[in-house]
Amino acid sequence: LTCLGGFASPGPVPPSTALRELIEELVNITQNQKAPLCNGSMVWSINLTAGMYCAALESLINVSGCSAIEKTQRMLSGFCPHKVSAGQFSSLHVRDTKIEVAQFVKDLLLHLKKLFREGQFN
């Protein structure tokens, strides 16, 4: 989690900075959304608790050809300790409903803002 260099600076990025940058990117996506995000692609919703970052990546990585979320996918990979590939789902990822990417991003953003306010950067 401390090796998140490359987003804003050349060296290791503090977790608080990395989280803030992820939040800023999600805000940017939601504010600049003109047409439906990723053509209305649907992804598995996730439980916003333990293993959230990996679960979010596992869900979003399946969407290809959507430039709007490519940076988010890269950022989330920095928070996830293991390599995630398309079609891969951990035991933490319960597949019970699919939602549009736009809603997924909004839900994730709200939760990350809450974590940031509470000082939970890891």
């Epitope: 439906p36 990723c38 053509n39 209305g40 692609s41 399946n62 050809g65």
Partner: nanobody, 116 residues
Amino acid sequence: EVQLLESGGGLVQPGGSLRLSCAASGFTFDREEMDWVRQAPGKGREWVSTISPRGRTTYYADSVRGRFTISRDNSKNMLYLQMNGLRAEDTAVYYCAKAYTGFKYWGQGTLVTVSS
């Protein structure tokens, strides 16, 4: 080019059944997870069901679980949705979709109307 053509919709009474079909072409069907998505009049898109590439694993929205059954025939590049115990709230245009690609590749859909 990805093409998806849905059929099988119609007017049915509450409690009735319909079987929707979707003919797929332009991609390697047996490698792709497939979805059924619906859109009720004046409402947003709602995920209905998903089936794994080989058809071994299926997933359903709570609203249709136990009533709808998704299946596929990879030899024919066909996707199906058997709908039993239909309710008024199931009235919608139903689309089949190549998972994770969005409505860029949706067909025209097939209208299901549940009414007495």
